[in-house]
Amino acid sequence: ALDTNYCFRNLEENCCVRPLYIDFRQDLGWKWVHEPKGYYANFCSGPCPYLRSADTTHSTVLGLYNTLNPEASASPCCVPQDLEPLTILYYVGRTPKVEQLSNMVVKSCKCS
Amino acid sequence: ALDTNYCFRNLEENCCVRPLYIDFRQDLGWKWVHEPKGYYANFCSGPCPYLRSADTTHSTVLGLYNTLNPEASASPCCVPQDLEPLTILYYVGRTPKVEQLSNMVVKSCKCS
């Protein structure tokens, strides 16, 4: 699986999850998030050669088409597969609130 | 929606579904498919500027991050959203067989 366990331990050029730290205030301008100050959102990148973690029959077909037609511009793209939520603390005035934001952290990637 | 109705009628540079005809024999080397000879598989391509048909909170966050940090290499990618099956005819010896291949045709795209 193209997950953090594999991708963060290997120098993988092809589609894999990459570490990306985002600071809420500096990178997004989100002043309303109190804690954490930032988090590892991660992202997916790298080429999708034929059959690499193909998501659907279409991505397999497209990967094969691309292999046999190297000049073609149509190829699968490396995108998130598994995402996890992030728990944040914010304030409503002086009152602290805890919220779970869904689909915030990329744990693995696929070729789609 | 970034679907064939919209994308095929507009000269859209950003993420959209693009027509792609695939000939089973010539492009994939699939001699076993009798009918059709080929089909419009289509594909997704084009930049994913901030908020363009964002798939998840992560892709929205990544798009925002990319907008505020233009030098960043992390950005969402244009990939299939809705896929449709394709019915094919093939032969087992002289016996015709009809099969529905799932997820063969891209009908719309998203930024993921």
Epitope: G29, W30, K31, W32, Y90, G93 | T60, V61
Partner: antibody
């Protein structure tokens, strides 16, 4: 230039409902919090609630809970306020405003307002 | 909810006079959860002061705010004709946000 434009104000019968829109431009919509404030004719200002568009977290004044729903569409930079079971005392100019960044905060940019009249 | 009591309800002063409006909260707001707005007829409110004493961008220096806890004040050092408006204080320490009832400022 920062702009907030409200629309959807109308003459409504008591018991009816209404959806107001607030379209934002000139700033990073998804990094901000949008509040709704109303003002009855000749009266003061009353805060109704606020929403964080990117994650659709909404906070409401207690007296409007159950009657007001705030939602956001980040693809169109629009915040919506649905107000149901309207009463004559809901007649007011409804403003959307951008906060300085927190859920409860001062509001630095306001729309021009949209008038809602509740009458039979 | 926190009740904000503004005084006076209205005042009429001469041009170049000093204006002081006070705002009292029914419970402590700490030092920074208070804002002041100006509203002219037919217009939306305009933020003048936030955090009790910080001027919003583009607001003339004749406008100032001070105070903490339950007692806050807003001052116009020298009244000008364009300052004719209704002024509101607003607390954002606790939900719901509440406003004072307003002070109508006129020129004699």
């Amino acid at each position: 230039e920062v702009q907030l434009v409200e629309s959807g104000g109308d003459l409504v019968k008591p018991g009816g409902s209404l959806r107001l829109s607030c379209v934002a431009s000139g700033f990073t919509f998804s990094s901000n919090v949008i509040s709704w404030v109303r003002q009855a004719p000749g009266q003061g200002l009353e805060w109704m609630g606020g929403v964080i568009p990117i994650v659709d977290i909404a906070n409401y004044a207690q007296r409007f809970k159950g009657r007001v729903t705030l939602t956001a569409d980040t693809s169109t930079n629009t915040v919506y306020m649905e107000l149901s079971n309207l009463r004559t005392e809901d007649t007011a100019v409804y403003y959307c405003a951008r906060t300085l960044g927190l859920v409860l905060d001062a509001m630095d940019y306001w729309g021009q307002g949209t008038l809602v009249t509740v009458s039979s | 909810e926190i009740v904000m009591t503004q005084s006076p309800a209205s005042l009429s002063l001469s041009q170049e006079e000093k204006v002081t409006i006070t705002c009292r909260a029914s419970q402590s707001l700490g030092s920074s959860y208070l804002a002041w707005y100006q509203q002219k007829p037919g217009q939306a409110p305009k933020l003048l002061i936030y955090g009790a004493s910080s001027r919003a961008p583009g607001v003339p220096s004749r406008f100032s705010g001070s105070g903490s806890g339950t007692d806050f004040s807003f001052t116009i050092s020298s009244l000008e004709p364009e300052d004719v408006a209704v002024y509101y204080c607003q607390q954002y320490a606790d939900s719901p946000i509440t406003f004072g009832q307003g002070t109508k400022l006129e020129i004699k």
